[in-house]
Interface confidence: low
């Protein structure tokens, strides 16, 4: 059986030269395991022979192959190697004696690239080596089999597949790839080396190449001088190696007193006590295997960190509002380090800290400490207060930087009526000053219900959300869990650390605004005269809802009025309305009845048709125009009357019936259509008439008489009658009435230009008024008739006329004005 | 040791206000939600509300809102109840209790492994 | 009235294994794994039993064991004993984050 010699760990050294045998025989590559068990379990120790290659070129052995073995430093014992069962040589033999003073030394080192993808290889000739690099050609055998019971089954000479090293001044590489499936099975190789016409063949070597890998050198090497005036040195862990590493970690300070160590961690970090101001510190790390196994990597680039004058730590803080924040100070003034009882300090070099805020950590460091900051107000292009250390003479230029934002934001939430997507709306108008920061939403979902104390959950997601014109930000759940509990907060990200605002819990059930009503209807009911409104309530949610309805006078203005509905079976409302004969615009919306949730928008608006809701409320206020002879006992007699205004006639007037009724002649009614006045013969001596007003319900039921009576028209019931102008719009007329043993239902005032048929206006006046303003254009050129009438139940009385303005008595019409 | 003491009895007559104290030792206080759980003669046990002393939020039973305020002062890991309104059927022994379960886990569902000796209140004109 | 429904009274002699029901919705013991019981001598403090359904705090004897069933929950005490006479109180976490009680269960050991 061929043993392939283990390299235990990864650096050896071969002999390859002339032999102190003679025997010729030739032997194929092979390994002594027992006399290299020993050296199996070294894991540390760098196993060492000699690759000692004879030297000079000689035509007659080129084809010869000079068999090398693993020497020690001396190249001694290099052909005692034997195989304990046999008892065969396994050094080589060489015939030519001619190399038995001479030899070449090789130093190799194997390793497993971190990346896992390539076993490498390095030799280098040690000096006084006969034979150039660049003259030599090397190859590199290798198999990998699998391995069983962890012993490597006999290799088979056919298996090897060679690659070619390449080879420069400095030495010689071979790179074997190694499939990741292969990483634990075993490597065997043997190399072959020719140079100057001769060749050198190694012994069989086996390794695992998983326990051979050299780890890139660790990146992201930083240092920070830490909360408690340590130096932190720290550095990216190695997240693609596939096993955990350990770290040795170098370090060099310069300062009143050097300090150099190495010191190795499994963290990726590592803590320097106390540092100090106006030092230098270098630092390099490289990595290895946690279990011991395997190749340190190349020591990373150095990294230098010098601490100024005056330390501070931390240097810049970055908190939110209400909380506390403490700097601690280390003061080198003159190469000399302050105590820490003589340092003062101060805020934007303007107000002094309060020394209650002030404490003593140490004999050199000083703490102040800020309690339930405010908000930092951007003073011009600073969005920070600077925070100095100060010794009692002197401020250092040097400060540290208090950054404090306002992460109160509130996040509001709204579900979509068809309960498919919850949107979130959030402002950052209070994070704006902090330069360089980005905002995100975060969120926790919470399989059923929100905590009693919403937390900012360490498993979180964030939610893109979109900058909308009005400044906030709007983020869109969907699909949503309607009885999950959704915790959420706002993120804010700094390179000086991220600042969380308190978190909310939303349910999606619970902020539902739901569709607005629908197939929203109005009307003024007829009789009753009430608006009527009716509703369908939205599909979802599924909640008991309530109502609110908003209805007002259609226009451009809309005044509205509300009315709330409770009862969540509702579909409809009445209202009691001041005007029954308007278009009124109607509106509803609805909200959760237990109020969680918002308000609906409004429906889309009902209009009430204005109908006729009730027959008219009175007939029309008339009066009368007499023509001919008053010493006639036939006269015509033209009612006049005023259209009724739609509160009047509930809402509209079909046409106008008079009534008339005689002595002789009984009752008869004359339907006057829609016009306003009606001509009729006065014979008899008493005729009373009554103007109805008639819509599409009917007739109204309360009307206004008027008795046209011959007697009557002689009873004179006003005394004296007066009109005094006020101005070209305002006349004040004032009366006498005489007592009378009639019942006066009321006076009508008429007036009109004097001899002008046309023209004449009226009014009724209450029976108790003694003076009135008539509020009329009044030319001041013309001449005016004013004629007062009193009004019987028994029938006109005898009006009093005057023509023109009385024109003594100003003072009076002043007194009556008063 | 892990322990609850409670204030002493109280005698109140109706429409006053009652505000008993728990304080709490051994344990971070701050950490756990602090029960209130009354219990009237003869009857059998009533959860009123709790409060998680380190975020200050106090919720309630439904039956309770509006009139129990429950308040702790982390500086003496104190709980305090107050019931405004009393009425004649408030008269009970009144327990505060510890929840098993340290904050931030859900809250209420470890159950109560620590008990005060309980305060009895008695209203009575 | 209470919300979780338990049995006004269980009665056993020393020895024998009892068990005590507490029905509640899916709005509580339903829902949850979140039942504890309690028991409580007269004039003293309630002591926690069984949380979480089924768990035991330490020093509580492996004689008493929790389980649930749907929307009701069960406390088996076995090997009864003298001293295990006292009122017995289910209670459960709710989809409201509160907690509710049973009306409680006195048990008499003959």
């Known amino acids: 059986l061929n043993l392939a010699y283990p390299i235990s760990p990864w650096k050896f050294k071969l002999f390859c030269g002339p032999p102190n045998t003679t025997d010729d025989s030739f032997l194929s590559p092979a390994g002594a395991p027992n006399n290299a068990s020993a050296l199996k379990g070294a894991s540390e120790a760098i196993v060492e022979a000699k690759f000692n290659s004879s030297g000079i070129y000689v035509p007659e052995l080129s084809k010869t192959v000079f068999h090398c073995c693993f020497g020690n430093e001396q190249g001694q014992n290099c052909s005692a190697l034997t195989d304990n069962t046999e008892g065969k040589t396994l050094a080589s033999v060489v015939k030519a004696s001619v190399f038995r003073q001479l030899g070449v030394n090789w130093d190799i080192e194997c390793w497993m690239k971190g990346d896992l993808t390539l076993f490498i290889c390095h030799m280098e000739p040690l000096p006084k080596n006969p034979f150039k690099n660049y003259d030599s050609k090397v190859h590199l055998l290798y198999d990998l089999p699998e391995v069983i019971d962890d012993s490597p089954l006999p290799p088979l000479k056919d298996s090897f597949q060679t690659v070619q090293c390449n080879c420069s001044l400095r030495g010689c590489e071979c790179h074997v790839p190694v499939p990741r499936a292969k990483l634990n099975y075993a490597l065997l190789m043997y190399l072959e080396i020719t140079s100057a016409g001769v060749s050198f063949q190694s012994p069989l070597m086996s390794l695992q190449p998983m326990l051979v890998v050299k780890p890139d050198p660790p990146l992201g090497l930083h240092m920070e001088v830490t909360d408690d005036g340590n130096l932190k040195i720290s550095w990216d862990s190695q997240t693609m190696a596939p096993f955990p590493l350990q770290y040795q970690v170098k370090y060099l300070e310069n300062s009143t007193i050097v300090r150099e160590a190495a010191e190795i961690v499994s963290a990726t970090s590592l803590l320097v006590d106390s540092v100090l101001p106006g030092s230098s510190y270098e630092v390099q790390v490289r990595s290895k295997r946690l279990d011991g196994s395997g190749v340190w990597s190349d020591w990373s680039s150095p990294q230098v960190f010098t601490t100024q004058d005056v330390v501070y730590f931390p240097p810049k803080i970055l908190t939110s509002v209400g909380s506390n924040a403490s700097f601690h100070c280390i003061y080198k003034n003159e190469n000399q380090i302050i105590s820490s009882k003589q340092i003062v300090w101060w805020r934007n070099l303007a107000e002094k800290i309060p020394e209650i805020q002030y404490s003593i950590v140490s004999d050199r460091v000083s703490k102040v400490t800020f309690s339930n900051l405010k908000a930092t107000r951007p003073r011009g292009k600073f969005t920070y207060d600077a925070v100095y250390c100060c010794n009692e003479q002197a401020c250092h230029h040097r400060y540290a930087e208090l950054y404090v934002i306002d992460v109160n934001i509130n996040i509001s939430c709204e579900t979509d009526g068809y309960l498919t997507k919850m949107t979130c709306r959030w402002s950052p108008s209070t994070i704006q000053s902090l330069v360089g920061s980005t905002v995100q939403l975060r969120y926790h979902r919470r399989s059923l219900y929100c905590p009693d104390s919403p937390s900012i959950h360490p498993t979180s997601e964030p939610k893109n959300c979109v900058l909308q014109r009005d400044g906030f930000y709007e983020c869109v759940f969907q699909p949503i869990f309607l009885l999950s509990g959704y915790t959420m907060w706002i993120r804010i990200n700094h390179s000086l650390g991220s600042l969380d605002s308190p978190p909310t819990c939303v349910l999606p059930d619970s902020v539902v605004k739901p569709l607005p009503p629908s197939n929203v209807k109005a009307e003024i009911t007829v009789n009753t005269g009430l608006l009527k409104v009716s509703w369908e309530k939205p599909v979802f949610p599924e909640n008991n809802l309530q109502f609110q309805i908003r209805y007002g006078l259609s226009g451009k203005e809309i005044q509205w009025k509300t009315h709330e509905v409770f009862d969540a079976k509702s579909k409809s409302a009445s209202l009691l309305v001041s005007d029954l004969c308007a278009v009124y615009v109607v509106q509803v919306r609805c909200r959760r009845l237990d109020g969680l949730g918002y308000w609906s928008n409004w429906s889309s608006p009902a209009y009430t048709l204005v109908m006729d809701v009730k027959v008219p409320m009175r007939g029309p206020e008339f009066w009368r125009k007499m023509d001919g002879d008053v010493t006639k006992k036939e006269r015509n007699v033209t009612l006049l009357w005023k259209p009724l205004t739609k509160n009047d006639s509930l809402c509209s007037v079909r046409r106008y019936v008079v009534k008339h009724r005689t002595a002789h002649n009984g009752t008869w009614s004359e339907d006057v259509g829609n016009r306003t006045n009606l001509t009729f013969l006065w014979t008899e001596p008493a005729h009373t008439v009554t103007v109805l007003a008639v819509n599409s319900l009917g007739a109204s039921l309360v009307n206004f008489n008027l008795t046209f009576s011959w007697p009557m028209s002689k009873v004179s019931a006003v005394e004296s009658l007066s009109a005094y102008p006020l101005s070209s719009s305002c006349v004040i007329l004032s009366w006498t009435l005489s007592p009378d043993d009639y019942s006066l239902l009321y006076l009508v005032i008429e007036w009109k230009i004097l001899n002008e048929d046309d023209g004449m206006k009226w009014l009724r006046i209450p029976s108790n008024v003694k003076k009135f303003y008539i509020h009329d254009n009044f030319i001041p050129i013309e001449k005016y008739q004013f004629s007062l009438y009193p009004v019987f139940m028994e029938g006109v009385g005898k009006p009093k006329i005057i023509n023109g303005f009385t024109k003594d008595a100003i003072d009076k019409q002043q007194n009556d004005a008063g | 040791e892990v322990q609850l003491v409670q204030s002493g009895a109280e005698v109140k007559k109706p429409g006053e206000s009652l505000k008993i104290s728990c304080q709490g030792s051994?344990?971070?206080?701050?950490?756990?939600?602090m029960n209130w759980v009354r219990q009237a003669p003869g009857k059998g046990l009533e959860w009123m509300g709790g409060?998680?002393?380190?975020?200050?939020?106090?919720n309630y039973a439904q039956k309770f809102q509006g009139r129990v305020t429950i308040t702790a002062d982390e500086s003496t890991s104190t709980a305090y109840m107050e019931l405004s309104s009393l009425r004649s059927e408030d008269t009970a022994v009144y327990y505060c209790a510890r929840d098993r379960v340290v904050v931030p886990a859900t809250s209420l569902r470890g159950g109560m492994d620590v008990w005060g000796q309980g305060t009895t209140v008695t209203v009575s004109s | 009235q209470s919300v979780l429904t338990q049995p006004a009274s269980v009665s056993g002699s020393p020895g024998q294994s009892i068990t005590i029901s507490c029905t509640g919705t899916?709005?509580?013991?339903?829902?949850?794994?979140?039942v504890s019981w309690y028991q409580q001598h007269p004039g003293k403090a309630p002591k926690l039993m069984i949380y979480?359904?089924?768990k035991r705090p330490s020093g509580v004897s492996n004689r008493f064991s929790g389980s649930k069933s749907g929307s009701t929950a069960s406390l088996t005490i076995s090997g009864l004993q003298a001293e295990d006479e006292a009122d017995y109180y289910c209670s459960s976490y709710t989809t409201r984050s509160t907690r509710v009680f049973g009306g409680g269960t006195k048990l008499t050991v003959l």
């Open positions: 979480e359904g089924s």
């Open positions: 899916s709005s509580d013991v339903g829902g949850y794994n979140y």
């Open positions: 409060i998680i002393p380190i975020f200050g939020t106090a």
């Open positions: 051994g344990f971070t206080f701050s950490s756990y939600k």
